[in-house]
């Protein structure tokens, strides 16, 4: 899995008038990391693990970046001609990634009232627009605004790409938290399914990094993909992740089944409780 930094900013308008302030969240490696506190006008870490990433450093740089980005997005919303009465939102999601081979990706996505209408591969400058006519109209509107000051926006987006990657590298280099290995806690449970069958569920929790293999085996052989149900690998709020896998088996055959887990080069097997 690549390391990633994801900015999610939203600005609002009411009856065509852009509202002051903005909403902002930042995710690091898929985990809630920062949010913008509108009362205090500051970027604040989301939980202890986020504080641990930067140690005792202040969040001034993050506050400055988010404030600048919020201002830019408000200006963009002001130039959308489509705004009718009522409440409307413009959301910008920016993601940069560093992959294992050190290659990078950087993308930007705009949503109006929750609908994606414009994306850009920031590195190559390729724009993509969904097929719908509304998306096409909105995209043309926003791109024309961005082109009005082409040199500024060109500099802005390249700086944005560089800044995102620079911040991500800074977090990765300064943080023991992001280089750590936390093995999962694995727990197997069973529940009655239907006559003669039981559902067995294998849960892995509190692990880092995110990459994990979790699968059911029968007599030491992995079950086929379509006989298992997998949960998403989700952040648990503590800077670690959780997931699960379940399958249905015949009652009385429990001893033939084990849950196999592989994480960060370590693996283990876990029997079904009797």
């Amino acid at each position: 899995e690549p390391h990633s930094l994801r900015y999610n900013l939203t600005v609002l308008s009411w009856d065509g008038s852009v509202q002051s302030g903005f909403l902002a969240e930042v995710h690091l490696d898929g985990q809630p990391f920062l949010r913008y506190d509108r009362q205090k006008c500051r970027a604040k870490p989301q939980g202890q693990w986020a504080e641990d990433v930067l140690g005792n450093k202040t969040w001034d740089r993050e506050t400055r970046d988010l404030t600048g980005n919020g201002k830019d997005l408000r200006m963009t919303l002001a130039h959308i001609k489509d705004q009718k009465e009522g409440l409307h939102s413009l959301q910008e999601i920016r993601v940069c990634e560093i992959h294992e081979d050190n290659s990078t990706r950087s993308s930007q996505h705009f949503y109006y009232d929750g609908e994606l209408f414009l994306s850009q591969n920031v590195e190559t400058e390729e724009w993509t627009v969904p097929q719908s006519s509304r998306a096409q109209t909105l995209a043309m509107n926003v791109r024309n605004f961005l082109k009005e000051d082409a040199m500024k926006t060109k500099t802005h987006y390249h700086a944005m790409h560089a800044d995102c990657l620079q911040e991500l590298r800074r977090y990765l280099e300064s943080s023991v938290v992001l280089r750590r290995r936390v093995p999962p806690m694995v727990n197997v449970t069973r529940s009655e399914a239907s006559e003669g069958n039981i559902t067995v569920t294998c849960r892995a929790s509190s692990f880092y990094p995110r990459n994990i293999t979790l699968t059911w085996r029968q007599d030491g052989v992995s079950l086929s993909h379509d006989t298992q149900q997998w949960g998403d690998v989700l952040p648990d709020g503590n800077g670690t992740y959780q997931t699960w896998v379940a399958t249905r088996i015949c009652q009385g055959e429990e001893q033939r089944f084990t849950c196999y887990m592989e994480h960060s080069g370590n693996h283990s097997t876990h029997p079904v409780p009797s």
């Epitope: 690549p2 294992e100 290659s103 390729e126 993509t128 082409a150």
Partner: antibody
Framework: QVQLQESGPGLVKPSETLSLTCTVS?????????WNWIRQPPGKGLEWMGF???????KYNPSLKSRVTISRDTSKNQFSLKLSSVTAADTAVYYC????????WGQGTTVTVSS | EIVLTQSPATLSLSPGERATLSCSAT???????FHWYQQKPGQAPRLLIY???NLASGIPARFSGSGSGTDYTLTISSLEPEDVAVYYC?????????FGQGTKLEIK
Amino acid sequence: QVQLQESGPGLVKPSETLSLTCTVSGYSITSDYAWNWIRQPPGKGLEWMGFVSYSGTTKYNPSLKSRVTISRDTSKNQFSLKLSSVTAADTAVYYCARGYGFDYWGQGTTVTVSS
Amino acid sequence: EIVLTQSPATLSLSPGERATLSCSATSSISSIYFHWYQQKPGQAPRLLIYRTSNLASGIPARFSGSGSGTDYTLTISSLEPEDVAVYYCQQGTTIPFTFGQGTKLEIK
């Protein structure tokens, strides 16, 4: 209809600079897209050399970066390639192409590097 | 850089047969930045399929594309003699843009 046409000398001496121009008709190079140079040595595959984007940004293949320059002349709706210090290994068919998924191509021009 | 490896290098099939060409990447590619090209002898390449699965203008429906992540496939459902060509995959996710080495399709 969008058309691209490469032009330039077909023979270049070793150590000299190869210069090619792509003339675009039917679309403004400042409207959108990347405007690319791609080459193909005889009997070999395709190699992307670089592009100039609609905004004027240039990107190059790191394998050629120190030798390649791509520029544009917006008044003529043209973009150009310069490749310095050429050797026989630069003998190829040179194509200009539009986009990121290259949807329009020139017909290609053969450049031979030989003394 | 992202290296694309195409297989097989050469494919020899009879008219009417189904052709499957593969392209494997060393790093994950966004499917909207993955494309296929056809190059016939003495001609410039032409865009065949863009963004993994969309047919370019004028391309017959017997051509289709699929894939995600690091593995992509071009399928020709029923080969025609005019499909003799070299087929290239290409990624536009990161700079430098790269092509596969090509698969040569021959008709028996």
